[in-house]
């Protein structure tokens, strides 16, 4: 087979129709789309293209210039009257720049064979395009059969002599793709087999998915895959001041389009998205989490003078619990409960009040009852102690009432009803409470426990005792019941306002049983235990004994 290497064809004077062609071509010089990267564009090459025609009387370059005097590289061939044409045009080496699939866009005109007299037998209306891959930039000394055919190119529109007369050119554009490519570069070849062709421009390009910022993730320029149906998964990187839960990914299609986004970046706490970037929250604004869309104003009673705040600081005397979200207003302890009233029923007290005028901005207000027992004479108060029961409870009361039971009768109490909320324990300020003073009702007194015998004679016994431990009121009098031992049904009762009595008219040398009880306005208490004392014999001296156990 003939070698395709060797001679350059010298430019010759172009026929009129080529000049017309060029005018048409100039009108089609458009910018390439952003997802196409040109490896070769014959329209933009300023100097010699360095292409080879073989044989040298086949394809010829027409040297023309555009309105800016830049050269226009056009190749033409029109050997339609001669048989067995095999004219080749070889490009220079084209780097594929890492692309594994490239596109070839041809702009050309083709003469209609029917419009040519006498050449119907030899005239063709197609030409062939080939490629040969090579790592070598000087590898054009190759054989025809080493080229791989890309396609046979036919014209959608061919022109006639009439078109020439009307100065109308019909420019065809055909695009073919080649891949997968495995070497650093390649050569293209155009084979004419007897057509009348003007090759106006050759543009070789690959497609990329252009670098883009999507969902705050930067995706780099990505060369499309070799396969026309292939989607390349590309990882994005988060823009400044942004973070991600799920690494951002997108898919680059063979057409150079970004598809199927997965994951996204979010502006980190203290930053918000504006115009595809993460901007700092300004003073007075905050963003607590990346998952929040934008910076928000500090909630009530809080502030921040910082940029990039993730929370706001509470004003003086306002607080935030750890469990309070940063979007919640800072709050303060409640004011005191109001209008407390009491209802005493014997040794029980029912307290009722209304909520504080100021809840401190919180809904978790509850109440605590402090109980103090006060000595009315000394004016000293002490904690009530554990014997008092609170219904339903002493602290954490949600309702505005409480009942205290098992109080001491006829005792002065002070109850402090304190309002508390979720930040009361954070505040160093004074407790906020309302006080209620009550005195429990009188009740029957407790038993007399401490009885001492005094002077004992043959016919009388003198006794003294102490007031009951719990008088439960004012002791009005005592009742003393006594009888001769084993004669219980025949007893005598003496009443006394004092804590001493003398029982008269007793039998000498006899044992008597004494029991004492006290009375208040509420009634008698229970009798004390039995105390036994014996009168002296007729001739014995009287005795004065101390306390009987």
């Amino acid at each position: 087979p003939a070698s395709l290497a060797g001679c350059y064809s010298a430019p010759r004077r172009a026929p009129l129709w080529t000049c017309l062609l060029l005018c048409a071509a100039l009108r089609t010089l458009l910018a390439s789309p952003s997802n196409e990267v040109n490896l070769l564009d014959s329209r933009t090459v300023m100097g010699d293209l360095g292409w080879i025609a073989f044989p040298k009387n086949g394809w010829e370059e027409i040297g023309e210039v555009d309105e800016n005097y830049a050269p226009i590289h056009t190749y033409q061939v029109c050997k339609v009257m001669e048989q067995n044409q095999n004219n080749w045009l070889l490009t220079s080496w084209i780097s594929n720049e890492g692309a594994s699939r490239i596109f070839i866009e041809l702009k050309f005109t083709l003469r209609d064979c029917n419009s040519l007299p006498g050449g119907l037998g030899t005239c063709k209306e197609t030409f062939n395009m080939y490629y040969f891959e090579s790592d070598d930039q000087n590898g054009r000394n190759i054989k025809e059969n080493q080229y791989i055919k890309i396609d046979t190119i036919a014209a959608d529109e061919s022109f006639t002599e009439l078109d020439l007369g009307d100065r109308v050119m019909k420019l065809n554009t055909e695009v073919r793709d080649v891949g997968p490519l495995s070497k650093k570069g390649f050569y293209l070849a155009f084979q004419d087999v007897g057509a009348c062709i003007a090759l106006v421009s050759v543009r070789v390009y690959y497609k990329k998915c252009p670098s883009v910022v999507r969902h705050l993730a930067v995706f780099p320029d990505t060369i499309t895959g070799a396969d026309s149906s292939q989607l390349l998964e590309v990882s994005g990187s988060c823009v400044n001041h942004s973070v991600t839960d799920e690494p951002p990914k997108m898919h680059c299609s063979a057409e150079g389009e970004w598809l199927v986004p997965i994951g996204k970046c979010m502006c980190k706490a203290g930053y918000e998205e504006k115009n595809g970037t993460c901007q700092v929250c300004r003073p007075g604004f905050f963003k607590a989490s990346p998952h929040i869309q934008s910076c928000g104003k500090c909630p009530p009673h809080s502030y921040t003078h910082e940029e990039a705040s993730t929370s706001c600081v509470c004003e003086k005397d306002y607080f935030r619990r750890e469990s309070d979200p940063p979007t919640m207003a800072c709050t303060r302890p409640p004011s005191a409960p109001r209008n407390a009233i009491s209802n005493v029923n014997e040794t029980s007290v029912f307290l009722e009040w209304i909520p504080p005028a100021d809840t401190g901005g919180r809904k978790d207000v509850s109440y605590y009852i402090a109980c103090k027992k006060c000595n009315s004479h000394a004016g000293v108060c002490e904690e009530c102690g554990g014997h008092v029961r609170y219904l339903p409870r002493q602290s954490g009361l949600k309702n505005t009432s409480v009942m205290m039971v098992d109080l001491l009768a006829h005792t002065n109490y002070t109850f402090e009803i304190e309002a508390v909320n979720g930040v009361s324990d954070l505040s160093p300020g004074a407790r906020q409470y309302v006080s209620v003073n009550v005195t429990t009702n009188q009740a029957a007194p407790s038993p007399v426990t401490n009885v001492k015998k005094g002077k004992i004679a043959k016919n009388s016994i003198s006794l003294s005792w102490q007031e009951p431990d719990r008088p439960n009121g004012i002791i009005l009098e005592y009742e003393i019941k006594y009888f001769e031992k084993d004669q219980e049904t025949s007893y005598t009762i003496i009443k006394s306002k004092e804590t001493t009595i003398t029982a008269e008219g007793l039998k000498p040398a006899s044992v008597y049983v004494f029991q004492i009880r006290a009375r208040t306005a509420a009634g008698y208490g229970v009798f004390s235990r039995r105390f036994e004392f014996e009168t002296t014999p007729v001739f014995a001296a009287s005795s004065d004994q101390s306390q009987i156990p």
């Epitope: 502030y303 003078h305 990039a308």
Partner: antibody
């Protein structure tokens, strides 16, 4: 009670240096932005510089940029203004003022001021 | 920088009358629906005192005869019934953008 007290003012020659202090009390100093504002004799107020509570954000007026440095020591509740390459036009009463807590913030408390005189 | 221009430079108003001071910013001092405009009062030999923040919010402890209005670039301080102690210089200040610029001041005298 919130108080700001400036000190360190005085007479200095052109090209000289001076360091002003502002002692703060009555509030949580470390959470407040503080500003320096000056007033030349018989003139209006001119904002000079500001610093956030954590010193993360600092701003200067163009007229003092590169010559003045604002700083703070939160452990001492004190704000500073280091003034270098002083010029006659820096003569003024210098006030420190606290950024407020009610949004959008104004300068809610001011010191009594300290006079800086730059003269040969 | 945002330039703040007050008008008038000075004015004299009778006791009990209304006084109005205007302030114009060279560009908007609004952000996110709020106006970053403050008004201060200064008496001779004293430190300035904050009267109004955020264009219309009365600072705590300031009498309610003081009021502020406006948004964007045009703002007004109004004293509804002038009292003797209101004789002072008044300054507007924007806090939307660094540097926080002041107006040149307006001197208010009692007629």
């Amino acid at each position: 009670e919130v108080q700001l007290v400036e000190s360190g003012g005085g007479l200095v020659q052109p090209g000289g240096s001076l360091k002003l202090s502002c002692a703060a009390s009555g509030f949580t100093f470390s959470t407040f932005g503080i500003h320096w504002v000056r007033q030349a004799p018989g003139k209006g107020l001119e904002w000079v510089a500001s610093i956030s509570g954590a010193s993360t954000t600092i701003y200067y007026a163009d007229s003092v940029k590169g010559r003045f440095t604002i700083s703070r020591d939160n452990s001492k509740n004190t704000l500073y203004l280091q003034m270098n390459s002083l010029r006659a036009e820096d003569t003024a009463v210098y006030y420190c003022a606290r950024y407020g807590t009610s949004f959008p913030y104004g300068l809610d408390y001011w010191g009594q001021g300290t006079l800086v005189t730059v003269s040969s | 920088d945002i330039v703040m221009t007050q008008s008038p430079d000075s004015l004299a108003v009778s006791l009990g009358e209304r006084a109005t001071i205007n302030c114009k910013a060279s560009q908007s001092v609004d952000y996110d629906g709020d106006s970053y405009m403050n008004w201060y009062q200064q008496k001779p030999g004293k430190a300035p005192k904050l009267l109004i923040y955020g264009a219309s919010n009365l600072e705590s402890g300031i009498p309610d005869r003081f009021s502020g209005s406006g948004s964007g670039t045009d703002f007004t301080l109004t004293i509804s019934r002038l009292e003797p102690e209101d004789a002072a210089s008044y300054y507007c200040q924007q806090s939307n953008e660094d540097p926080f610029t002041f107006g040149q001041g307006t001197k208010l005298e009692i007629k």
